[in-house]
Amino acid sequence: FNLSYPITPWRFKLSCMPPNSTYDYFLLPAGLSKNTSNLNGHYETAVEFNSSDTHFSNLSKTTFHCCFRSEQDRNCSLCADNIEGKTFVSTVNSSVFQQMGANWNIQCWLKGDLKLFICYVESLFKNPFKNYKHKVHLLYVLPEVLEDSPLVPQKGSFQMVHCNCSVHERCECLVPVPTAKLNDTLLMCLKITSGGVIFQSPLMSVQPINMVKPDPPLGLRMEITDDGNLKISWSSPPLVPFPLQYEVKYSENSTTVIREADKIVSATSLLVDGILPGSSYEVQVRGKRLDGPGIWSDWSTPHVFTTQDVIYFPPKILTSVGSNVSFHCIYKNENKIVSSKKIVWWMNLAEKIPQSQYDVVSDHVSKVTFFNLNETKPRGKFTYDAVYCCNEHECHHRYAELYVIDVNINISCETDGHLTKMTCRWSTNTIQSLAGSTLQLRYRRSSLYCFDIPSIHPISKPKDCYLQSDGFYECVFQPIFLLSGYTMWIRINHPLGSLDSPPTCVLPDSVVKPLPPSSVKAEIIKNIGLLKISWEKPVFPENNLQFQIRYGLSGKEIQWKMYDVYDAKSKSVSLPVPDFCAVYAVQVRCKRSDGLGLWSNWSNPAYTVVMDIKVPMRGPEFWRIINGDTMKKEKNVTLLWKPLMKNDSLCSVQRYVINHHTSCNGTWSEDVGNHTKFTFLWTEQAHTVTVLAINSIGASVANFNLTFSWPMSKVNIVQSLSAYPLNSSCVILSWILSPSDYKLMYFIIEWKNLNEDGEIKWLRISSSVKKYYIHDHFIPIEKYQFSLYPIFMEGVGKPKIINSFAQDNTEKHQNDEQKLISEEDLGGEQKLISEEDLHHHHHH
C-alpha cells in the first residue's frame, strides 16, 4: 500500500495549492516517476504546489488532488475513483486561492464503542473557501484479503458516505466498521466540493484499532487516605479492548498557593501527597491506549474536592483495647499553615494530651500517639472519643474519632457424641456494639494439632454462624477432622476497618461432648434400703470415661446430690438415702477421664418406684370415742387412728388389722382394710385392742395397745387441770398428778369446741410432761372443753375435764410466756413430742 497515506493518530492538514505549469516543481510520491500514469490513465501527478504565479483560466474544469502537509515529508498519492467528465463552474476568488491555497484540518478516530470510524474535516481559518458551502464525501473500502488485492482497489469498489456539514466549517464523516474488521486496513479518500471546485485527498490507509479514541474515564472520585494522601480513582470506560494509560491533571487552589500538575499512569487510581488544608482540588482524567497507537480521550468532567482547614489522618480509628494508635494533623489557620511545633492535642475538649505523646513528623504535620488504650466509654449517643488538634489555645471545631473496642470474645466449641460435627458458640454481649459493624467467625485448619500460641493467619475462611434465641451465635463445622487444629477468631468488619478477637485453637477431639449414658435405672434395694443406680456407657468416644450421678427426691424443685464415679469400668453404684419410701430422680452424665472434653448432657431421668422394703416399723397411734350411756355395761367404742407415714410404713400400708383380746373370748382379729376408724362393742370388764399396719411384706411388729377397763376408768390421778390461752393459736394446758401404783404409759389430751358439733381433737403425749402447748385455732368468745386422760398399762384412767379457761392466772401466764418457753421442764423431749403431736393434730 505504498500509494496510500498512513493516517497518524493526530490532527493533520490537507493542503490544496494551485497547479504549476512546470513539472520541475512537482514533488512526486515515493516510487512515482514523472511519466507514471495514474490510475485513471492520465499523466497527472498529485502534488503540493508552492508556486503562486499561475493564472486560472481553466480552474472550473479541474479536480484538485491535494496533499497532506507534514514537516518531515510532502507525500501525495492518488485516490482511486476520480470523477471524470464533469464540469464545475468556479466562483472562487482566484487571487486568494493563488496566494494561499485551500487548507483543511482532518482528524480521524475510532469511537470508544468500537463501532464507528469518524473523521472530522474542518476548514482552516484563512481558507479562501471557508465562506462557501461545503459538500464532503468520504470514499472508503475495507478490502477482504489484503495480500491478494491489487495495489489499490479497483474503481467502483469504494463505498461513499455523505458527511454531515451542518456545523459551520466542520463536517463529520461516519464509517461503520464491523467488529471483525477492526484490525483490517481501511482505505479511504475525501472529496470536498466547495465554491464549485472539487478537492480530492490522496488515498489514506488506517487500521481502525490503532485509532481508538476511548470515551473519557468514568466515576472520578477523591478521598483522603489514612496516611494523609489524596486518593484519586476512576473507572476505565466500558468496551475498551485493551489496557489504557491515563493522564491525570489537577489544579490546587488555596489561599496560599495555586498550582497545576499532571501525571501519566497505567492504574485507575493514584495518590497525591502533600495535600493542603483549606484547599480545593479540581481533577480531570483522560485515557489513551497503553501499549500501542491511539488517541487521547476527551477529558473527564472536572471533579472538585475541598479539604477542611484541619486535616486529620486518619480521620477515624477503630482499634482494640490495649493497642497503640496515632493520629496526624495539618492545621491551616487564617491563611497560614500552622507549624507542627505549635500544635497541641486535646481529648474530648476536656483533657489535654501530654506533650510526651506528640511527634513532629515535619514542619507542618503533628502526630499524637495513644498507648495501651482502654475501651471507649459511650458518652450519650457518642460511641467514640473526640481527638482535637489545636493551634496552641485555639481548637477548630473539627475532630478525629477514636473508637476502642474490647474484642475479647470467648469462642467455645463442642464435638457431638457421634464425632461427626463440631458446634462453636460465641456471644457479642461482652463487647460494645458499633453501628455499621458485622461480625464473622473466621478459621484456619491445620493438618494436625494446635500450635502452642494460636495466631491469626492471613489466609482464613469465613464460617456461617446463626443467632440463637439465647443471644449466642452458633456455627457448625461438618465434616470435621478430629485431630486437626481449628484456629478461630471473630472478625469485626466495619467501614473504619476490621478488628480480630484473640484467636483460639480447638482440637475437635479434645472438646468431645459424649452422648449421655444410656439405660439408666434406679431402684431401692429390698431389706438393705440402698439406692442402686445402673447405666451403660456411650459408644463414643472410646476413651476412658468418668461418670457423675445426680439424685434427689422427685418434685418440682429437685435438690440434687452429686456423686462421682472415677472407675471407667463401673456400670452401677449403690448409695445410701435417708428416705427409702420416696421417689428418687436419678441422672447420669459422663466425660473423658483425662480431663479433656466436656461433660455429656445429663441422661434422661430415671425414677425409683416406691415399693415396700420392710414390714412397717410400727402400727398407728390410736384413740377412741365411746358412744352410748356411760352407765350401761355395753358401750360402742370407735377407734380412731392416723394413717402411718412412709418412714413408718416402709413404704406403704395396704390395710389395717385390729387385734382384740378379752378374758372370755380370748384373742381374735378383724381386717378393716385401709380405713382409719373402727367401731366395736365393749362388753367385758377389760378389752384390749391393738392396731396393726400391714404392707406387702408383712405386719408391723411394734404396735400400740389400748385396754378398756371398767375398774381402771375409775382410777383418778389427775388432781387438777388448767387451761391458759396465750393467744388465738395457742393454749397452755398444765396439770397436777397425785401418786399412783399403776404404771403410767402416756397421756391423751382431748379438746373440742363446745359451741360446735366439731370432731374431737386429740394428742398423745409423754407421761413425764406437766405442761403442754396446744397449737390450734382458738376463738376467744367460744367455749372449749379440755380433757386429760392418763393411760396406764392396765387401761385408760379417769380423765380430768374442764370447760373453761382459768381466769386467775391468765395474765400471769401471758406475762410469763417467754419464761415458760425457756423453762427446762419444756426440754428437748417435750418439744419433740409437741412438734410430733402438732404434726398429728394437723392431720386429724
Epitope: 494523609g228 498557593v257 495555586i258 497525591v272 502533600g274 493542603l276 497560614k336 515535619s362 507542618h364 504535620v365
Partner: antibody
Framework: QVQLQQWGAGLFKPSETLSLTCDVY????????WSWIRQPPGKGLEWIGE???????NYNPSLKSRVIISIDTSKNQFSLKMSSVTAADTAVYYC????????????WGQGTLVTVSS | EIVLTQSPGTLSLSPGERATLSCRAS???????LAWYQQKPGQAPRLLIY???SRATGIPDRFSGSGSGTDFTLTISRLEPEDFAVYYC?????????FGQGTKVEIK
C-alpha cells in the same frame, strides 16, 4: 535540618541532553514538591518546573517540550533532564524544596553551573 | 505568564538606612501569592517573605513585606552590613511561577 546536594556534569555540547540530580538529606521527602530553578550568569531566576513525591509534574510552558523532571523516592532524590540544549541554556541550575502549602522555595541546593558550548 | 518588574535596578544605601524595594506585576496577583528572596554572590537565594507579608523562619523583623494587586514592596527598616545583596520577588499564583529581574542593594 534539610539539605539538598546536587550533582551532574557541568559542560555540554549543543543538542545534548543535560542531566542533573538532587539528593535530599534530613527532614521529610514525602509531602513536598521539589523544584528546579536556573539563573543565567548575571541574570535573574527562572523557574523550570517541579515534581511531587507522588510523581506529579508541573513545568514552565516555555521549557516543557524539552524538560523531564523525575523522582526516585527510594533514594530521596529527584532529577532534571533537558534535551537539545543550546548556549541559551547556560546557567547555574538550582534544586529547591517547595515550601509546603506555598509556591515558595525554602531550601536550596548549592547550585551547579552548566555551560553549553561547542 | 505574569511578568514581574522590579525597581530600582540598583539601590545604593548606607548601613542603618531604610531600603524600599518595589515589585510590579503585569496582572493582579493575590497578596497570598507573592514572595521575596535575598541572594548573595555565589550563594543560592534565601526565602525572606511569603504571602506578601509573612516572614519566613529565622528572618529578622527588620524585613517586612506589603502590597496587593499589582504593587508590592519589600522594606528593610535598618540596613545591616549583611543585607547588601540582590533581592528578587516571585509570584506563585499563576503558572508558570515567575521571578522579577532583581534589585541590587549596594553599599553607598
Amino acid at each position: 535540618q534539610v539539605q539538598l546536594q546536587q550533582w551532574g556534569a557541568g559542560l555540554f555540547k549543543p543538542s545534548e541532553t543535560l542531566s542533573l540530580t538532587c539528593d535530599v538529606y534530613g527532614g521529610s521527602f514525602r509531602g513536598y514538591y521539589w523544584s528546579w530553578i536556573r539563573q543565567p550568569p548575571g541574570k535573574g531566576l527562572e523557574w523550570i518546573g517541579e515534581i511531587s513525591y507522588s510523581g506529579f509534574t508541573n513545568y514552565n510552558p516555555s521549557l516543557k517540550s524539552r524538560v523531564i523532571i523525575s523522582i526516585d523516592t527510594s533514594k530521596n532524590q529527584f532529577s532534571l533532564k533537558m534535551s537539545s540544549v543550546t548556549a541559551a541554556d547556560t546557567a547555574v541550575y538550582y534544586c529547591a524544596r517547595v515550601t509546603y502549602g506555598y509556591g515558595t522555595f525554602d531550601y536550596w541546593g548549592q547550585g551547579t553551573l552548566v555551560t553549553v558550548s561547542s | 505568564e505574569i511578568v514581574l518588574t522590579q525597581s530600582p535596578g540598583t539601590l545604593s544605601l548606607s548601613p542603618g538606612e531604610r531600603a524600599t524595594l518595589s515589585c510590579r506585576a503585569s496582572q493582579s496577583v493575590s497578596s497570598s501569592y507573592l514572595a521575596w528572596y535575598q541572594q548573595k554572590p555565589g550563594q543560592a537565594p534565601r526565602l525572606l517573605i511569603y504571602g506578601a507579608s509573612s516572614r519566613a523562619t529565622g528572618i529578622p523583623d527588620r524585613f517586612s513585606g506589603s502590597g496587593s494587586g499589582t504593587d508590592f514592596t519589600l522594606t528593610i527598616s535598618r540596613l545591616e552590613p549583611e543585607d547588601f545583596a540582590v533581592y528578587y520577588c516571585q509570584q506563585y499564583g499563576s503558572s508558570p511561577w515567575t521571578f522579577g529581574q532583581g534589585t541590587k542593594v549596594e553599599i553607598k
